[in-house]
Amino acid sequence: MMTGTIETTGNISAEKGGSIILQCHLSSTTAQVTQVNWEQQDQLLAICNADLGWHISPSFKDRVAPGPGLGLTLQSLTVNDTGEYFCIYHTYPDGTYTGRIFLEVLESSVAEHGARFQIP
């Protein structure tokens, strides 16, 4: 039975050219996290595998950095980066938990950043 819940940064905004941290946190379960996948729509950005470590998609390696923790840092943001991002927690024995973050990249220099999520 899946008892866990995913907390995310929710809806966030950032300035064009800047960077942002995408963060999710799985709580209320003792399941082992075997892998976390970060996806933008159906495009795989990065993977953090418990045994194999971090893998960044070749097409994003210049603009995506692993961490902090199981999170993901997006750099040199463009307006095309606006959209839905998903953290997919593969766990054992629970199964898979998915969290959603919506990022809006603004042209304006007065983009209001959402509160950064901190893992306790």
């Epitope: 892998q35 996948n37 795989l44 045994d51 998903f86 593969h90 766990t91």
Partner: antibody
């Protein structure tokens, strides 16, 4: 290229323990996940479990209490132990590699398989 | 566990026919769907991963599509060596689970 070969007894008595070995040739067992999958005659495929080089194991909850997997890097082999077998465990047992690439992005895509070994549970 | 249901369970077709097999997951698996081909007496062969990406060496007459819960495998022009059983499999969640198979027979 990488090839897998299962070996073990074709006949096991009820309540005994089944032990199978998979030998990897043409490549190394390191840095991959390795799985066991079984198929009863005329039926579908059932994943039994996986093991990683480090010894990390993940078992199908339906079989977890009876399954033990191990890996021997020096022999380039991994093995399956299934205890307290019954006639319901009669099947072809396959070993398989779980190919991990950024494109696949997840464990559970079985890109290389052994030819399978038939195991019958009968007294 | 995630249940995978294939349809039809069997079909009859002729060489040159276009064949479509469907696979439905009991919950969304995004695009974490693989397809395999099994010839009687042989091990399954990996055909398609990530719902639509062709494994190296697999003929281009095979194609896959879908996301979420509904997926299809299409063989654009059936060849004699394609008569086999096809299985879908989800790799979204542990344990990985397979469909019950679709047997493609000669008409």
């Amino acid at each position: 290229q990488v090839q897998l070969q299962e070996s073990g007894p074709g006949l096991v008595k009820p309540s005994e323990t089944l032990f199978l070995t998979c030998t990897v040739s043409g490549g190394s067992v390191t840095n991959y996940y390795w799985s066991w999958i079984r198929q009863p005659a005329g039926k579908g495929l059932e994943w039994i479990g996986r093991i990683y080089t480090s010894g990390s194991t993940y078992y199908n909850p339906s079989l977890k209490s009876r399954v033990t997997m191990s890996l021997d890097t020096s022999k380039n082999q991994f093995s399956l132990r299934l205890s307290s077998v019954t006639a319901a465990d009669t099947a072809v047992y396959y070993c398989a590699r779980e190919g991990f690439t950024m494109v696949r992005g997840v464990m559970g895509a079985f890109d290389i398989w052994g030819q399978g070994t038939m195991v019958t549970v009968s007294s | 566990d995630i249940q995978m249901t294939q349809s039809p369970s069997s079909l009859s077709a002729s060489v040159g026919d276009r064949v479509t097999i469907t696979c439905r997951a009991s919950q969304s698996i995004r695009r974490y769907l693989n397809w395999y081909q099994q010839i009687p007496g042989k091990a399954p062969k990996f055909l398609i991963y990530d719902a639509s990406s062709l494994q190296s060496g697999v003929p281009s007459r095979f194609s896959g599509s879908g996301s979420g819960t509904d997926f299809t495998l299409t063989i654009s022009s059936l060849q004699p060596e394609d008569f086999a059983t096809y299985y879908c499999q989800q790799s979204y969640s542990t344990p990985p689970t397979f469909g019950q198979g679709t047997k493609v027979e000669i008409k």
